[in-house]
Interface confidence: medium
C-alpha cells in the first residue's frame, strides 16, 4: 500500500483556486526525491503538470505552483483560475509517475451558481443555523410574511407569518418580526441539512404590491482535515462545534458503507469495543469544544472520523460536525513493542515502552487508563523519581535500555492489576503506546520468602530461589526506592531445593545485609535480567526492630520470620494468618479484610490466606517505612 | 505530591495588569497538566485558566479569553497567569492547581494537589 496519502475528491467552482495538500513518510530519501502532480489519461499513464524539479505544463503555466514542505513531510500543489477542463483524475506523488508512490485525487468544476438578480447568498455549514432577512415596505407591514422554497418550477411555502410550517422544518424553523421602526423580517433556520440548499423567497404581501427579496442558501458539507499518523502511533482529534451545542452529548464517529457512522466514543458513556483501552475523550469545556486522543493506531483505524453534538450522541441529520480523514502510515517509526502481556498473580511483568530517541531526555510516564468517565489516564510513575503512594515497593520505571525504549516493572500483581497501560513521554506527543495486561494462572518462578523482620545491629540473608529456566540470566538483588531499584551484592548458594523435577541449574541467590541499620528497612526486589533487559521480579519487605537477642539471622522460606501467631506447615512452607503485621496506614476495621485495596487502585494492602508458596512470591504484607 | 505556592496577587486598578506565579516544590510542575481557578466571595470556585505539560494546549474561561494568558517555564518549575485589562469582577483567591491525569485537558474533579491561593483585588 502506498505510503503517499492526500484529499479523494476535491471539489470548486469556476474561477476559483484550490491548494491540494500530499502527505509522506518524512525519510530523508523522500525529502529530498522529486515531488509532482500529474493527470491520469483514459488509456492509464500518467502526464505531469507539474513537479519539484521546476517543470510547469503550459496548461498551467502562470496559475499552479508546488511546494515541498520537508521538515512535514508535505508538498502543496496550488492551482488558480479553475475551468470546468480541469475536472478529472490526478495522482500526486513521489519520485517517477509509474512507480506507484502516489495517491489518487479526484477534482470536480463545477459551474457557479447562475443566481437571479438581487438574490442574497447564504452559505453555512451542515448543522449550524441561518437567518434569511427579508426587508419590506410600510404598506405591507401588516400583511402576511412568508418564505417560499423553489422545488423545481415550483415555490412551496416554508413558513409563513399565520402559523404554518411546512413538515420538513418542524422544531427548527421560526419567523420573527422586527420591532415597528424596523421593516424586516427574518426567517431563522436551526440544524441545516443538505436539502434544506437552494433557492429561496421571501415575501410580505399577497398582492401585486408585495415585497420580494430573493435568497440562495448553500449548505457546507465539511471538508475533512486530512490527518496523517503512523502505525502504532496516536491521533487527536480536536473538535469545536460552537457554544450553541456546549450542553448537547457529543461523539466521535467512524463512517463505514454509505451513509452510517458507528459511533467510536460519546459522551454518554458509549465507546466501541474495538478502541477500548486506548481511547480518552477529553472533558468538554464551555465553547463547546472537546478533544479526542486514540493510541495504538491500527490499520483498520483509517478512514473518515466525524465528530458532532446531538441529544441522541450518534449522527442525525442536522448534527453540526467536524470531519477528518485518518491515513495510518504503515512505514511507521515507532517500533512495535508487545500489546499485551501476561503476568502470574504473585508475579511480575516487565513492559517495554518505545518513546522518541530524539528525546531521550524527555520526562516518561506511565498511567492506568480507566473506562470511567469517558476515559482517563491517572499517572502511576515517572522517570522524575514519583510513584504514586498505593503503588510504592512494587512499581519502577527503569530508563533501560534506553535509546528509544524504558522499561516498566510491576510486580506483586493481583487480578486488579489486568487492564490498559499508557506509556507517555512529555515530548512527542504522537509515541503514545498501549499496553495490555492480563493475569493468568500459574505460579510465580521466583521464590522468596515473605515479609522479613531484621534486627537492628545484625546480619540478615534472605534467600530468592530460580528455576532452572533463568540458568542463562543474570540474577540480582536490588533495594527499591522512588527512583529505581539500587542493585546490591549478592552471593550464589548454589543449587536451590525448592523445585521440583529441576536439576543443578537452579540457583539460590542471597542478599546480605551485615549490621542492619533502620535505613535498611524497606522494599527489596529479586530478579532477573538479560543485559538492560528486565525479567521476572519478586519483592520482600524487610522491617527492622530492635535488638531482642545476639546472634545473626538466615531466613529460609521455611521459619522466615515465624511469629506465634503463624503456623509452619509440613511443606516447608509458611502460612501467614490474618493476624499479621498490617500495613500502618490501614484503619483499624479494614485491617482483616482480605485483598483490599487503597482507594481501589492497586495498593495490595491485604493478607491473603491463599497456599503458602503463593505467599511466598507474591510478599503482599505491607510494611511502609516514611 | 507536588506543593504549589503562588504568589504574585495585590491590589491594582481596573484597567491594569498582574502577574501571577504558581511555584512548585516536591516534584517537577511539567508532569502536571497545571490550571488556574479563582473564588469570589460568597461564590463557587471557578475555572479560569489551564496548560497541559509541555504548554503547547492551553484553555481559558471565556470571561478571560483575550485578557489573559497562561504560560509555564518547566526550568523553573513555575507556572504563570498574565492578567491584562482587569476588571472589578475579576476581583477573587486566585488559586494553583495541578493534575496528575493524563487526558490533554483535564476538569476540576481531577486536580488533586491545590495551592493556598492569592488575593486579587480589581479597584474601579
Known amino acids: 500500500k502506498s505510503p503517499i496519502f492526500g484529499p479523494e475528491e476535491v471539489n470548486s467552482v469556476e474561477g476559483n483556486s484550490v491548494s491540494i495538500t500530499c502527505y509522506y513518510p518524512p525519510t530523508s530519501v523522500n525529502r529530498h526525491t522529486r515531488k509532482y502532480w500529474c493527470r491520469q489519461g483514459a488509456r492509464g499513464g500518467c502526464i505531469t503538470l507539474i513537479s519539484s524539479e521546476g517543470y510547469v505544463s503550459s496548461k498551467y503555466a502562470g496559475r499552479a505552483n508546488l511546494t515541498n514542505f520537508p521538515e512535514n513531510g508535505t508538498f502543496v500543489v496550488n492551482i488558480a483560475q479553475l475551468s470546468q477542463d480541469d475536472s478529472g483524475r490526478y495522482k500526486c506523488g513521489l519520485g517517477i509517475n509509474s512507480r506507484g508512490l502516489s495517491f489518487d485525487v479526484s477534482l470536480e468544476v463545477s459551474q457557479g451558481p447562475g443566481l437571479l438578480n438581487d438574490t442574497k447568498v447564504y452559505t453555512v455549514d451542515l448543522g449550524r443555523t441561518v437567518t434569511i432577512n427579508c426587508p419590506f415596505k410600510t404598506e405591507n407591514a401588516q400583511k402576511r410574511k412568508s418564505l417560499y422554497k423553489q422545488i423545481g418550477l415550483y415555490p412551496v411555502l416554508v413558513i409563513d407569518s399565520s402559523g404554518y410550517v411546512n413538515p420538513n422544518y418542524t422544531g427548527r424553523i421560526r419567523l420573527d418580526i422586527q420591532g415597528t421602526g424596523q421593516l424586516l423580517f427574518s426567517v431563522v433556520i436551526n440544524q441545516l441539512r443538505l436539502s434544506d440548499a437552494g433557492q429561496y423567497l421571501c415575501q410580505a404581501g399577497d398582492d401585486s404590491n408585495s415585497n420580494k427579496k430573493n435568497a440562495d442558501l448553500q449548505v457546507l458539507k465539511p471538508e475533512p482535515e486530512l490527518v496523517y499518523e503512523d502505525l502504532r502511533g496516536s491521533v487527536t482529534f480536536h473538535c469545536a462545534l460552537g457554544p450553541e451545542v456546549a450542553n448537547v452529548a457529543k461523539f466521535l464517529c467512524r463512517q463505514s458503507s454509505g451513509e452510517n457512522c458507528d459511533v467510536v466514543v460519546n459522551t454518554l458513556g458509549k465507546r466501541a469495543p474495538a478502541f477500548e483501552g486506548r481511547i480518552l475523550l477529553n472533558p468538554q469545556d464551555k465553547d463547546g469544544s472537546f478533544s479526542v486522543v486514540i493510541t495504538g493506531l491500527r490499520k483498520e483505524d483509517a478512514g473518515r472520523y466525524l465528530c458532532g453534538a446531538h441529544s441522541d450522541g450518534q449522527l442525525q441529520e442536522g448534527s453540526p460536525i467536524q470531519a477528518w480523514q485518518l491515513f495510518v502510515n504503515e512505514e511507521s517509526t515507532i517500533p512495535r513493542s508487545p500489546t499485551v502481556v501476561k503476568g502470574v498473580a504473585g508475579s511480575s511483568v516487565a513492559v517495554l515502552c518505545p518513546y522518541n530517541r530524539k528525546e531521550s531526555k524527555s520526562i516518561k510516564y506511565w498511567c492506568l487508563w480507566e473506562g470511567a468517565q469517558n476515559g482517563r489516564c491517572p499517572l502511576l510513575v515517572d522517570s522524575e523519581g514519583w510513584v504514586k503512594a498505593q503503588y510504592e515497593g512494587r512499581l519502577s520505571l527503569l530508563e533501560e535500555p534506553g535509546n528509544g525504549t524504558f522499561t516498566v516493572i510491576l510486580n506483586q500483581l493481583t487480578s486488579r492489576d489486568a487492564g490498559f497501560y499508557w506509556c507517555l513521554t512529555n515530548g512527542d506527543t504522537l509515541w503514545r503506546t498501549t499496553v495490555e495486561i492480563k493475569i493468568i494462572e500459574g505460579e510465580p518462578n521466583l521464590k522468596v520468602p515473605g515479609n522479613v523482620t531484621a534486627v537492628l545491629g545484625e546480619t540478615l540473608k534472605v534467600p530468592c530461589h530460580f528455576p532452572c529456566k533463568f540458568s542463562s540470566y543474570e540474577k540480582y538483588w536490588c533495594k527499591w526506592n522512588n527512583t529505581g531499584c539500587q542493585a546490591l551484592p549478592s552471593q550464589d548458594e548454589g543449587p536451590s531445593k525448592a523445585f521440583v523435577n529441576c536439576d543443578e541449574n537452579s540457583r539460590l541467590v542471597s542478599l546480605t545485609l551485615n549490621l542492619v541499620t533502620r535505613a535498611d528497612e524497606g522494599w527489596y526486589w529479586c530478579g532477573v535480567k538479560q543485559g538492560h533487559f528486565y525479567g521476572e521480579t519478586a519483592a520482600v519487605y524487610v522491617a527492622v526492630e530492635e535488638r531482642k537477642a545476639a546472634g545473626s539471622r538466615d531466613v529460609s522460606l521455611a521459619k522466615a520470620d515465624a511469629a506465634p501467631d503463624e503456623k509452619v506447615l509440613d511443606s516447608g512452607f509458611r502460612e501467614i494468618e490474618n493476624k499479621a503485621i498490617q500495613d500502618p496506614r490501614l484503619f483499624a476495621e479494614e485491617k482483616a479484610v482480605a485483598d483490599t485495596r487503597d482507594q481501589a487502585d492497586g495498593s495490595r494492602a491485604s493478607v491473603d490466606s491463599g497456599s503458602s508458596e503463593e505467599q511466598g512470591g507474591s510478599s503482599r504484607h505491607h510494611h511502609h517505612h516514611h | 505530591e507536588v506543593q504549589l505556592v503562588e504568589s504574585g496577587g495585590g491590589l491594582v486598578q481596573a484597567g491594569g495588569s498582574l502577574r501571577l506565579s504558581c511555584a512548585a516544590s516536591?516534584?517537577?510542575?511539567?508532569?502536571?497538566?497545571t490550571g488556574w481557578f479563582r473564588q469570589a466571595p460568597g461564590k463557587e470556585r471557578e475555572f479560569v485558566a489551564r496548560i497541559d505539560w509541555s504548554g503547547s494546549s492551553t484553555d481559558y474561561a471565556d470571561s478571560v479569553k483575550g485578557r489573559f494568558t497562561i504560560s509555564r517555564d518547566n526550568a523553573k518549575n513555575t507556572v504563570y497567569l498574565q492578567m491584562n485589562s482587569l476588571k472589578p469582577e475579576d476581583t477573587a483567591v486566585y488559586y494553583c492547581?495541578?493534575?496528575?491525569?493524563?487526558?490533554?485537558?483535564?476538569?476540576?474533579?481531577?486536580?488533586?494537589?491545590w495551592g493556598q491561593g492569592t488575593q486579587v483585588t480589581v479597584s474601579s
Open positions: 492547581a495541578g493534575s496528575a491525569y493524563y487526558s490533554g485537558y483535564v476538569t476540576h474533579r481531577d486536580f488533586g494537589s
Open positions: 516536591g516534584r517537577t510542575i511539567n508532569t502536571y497538566v
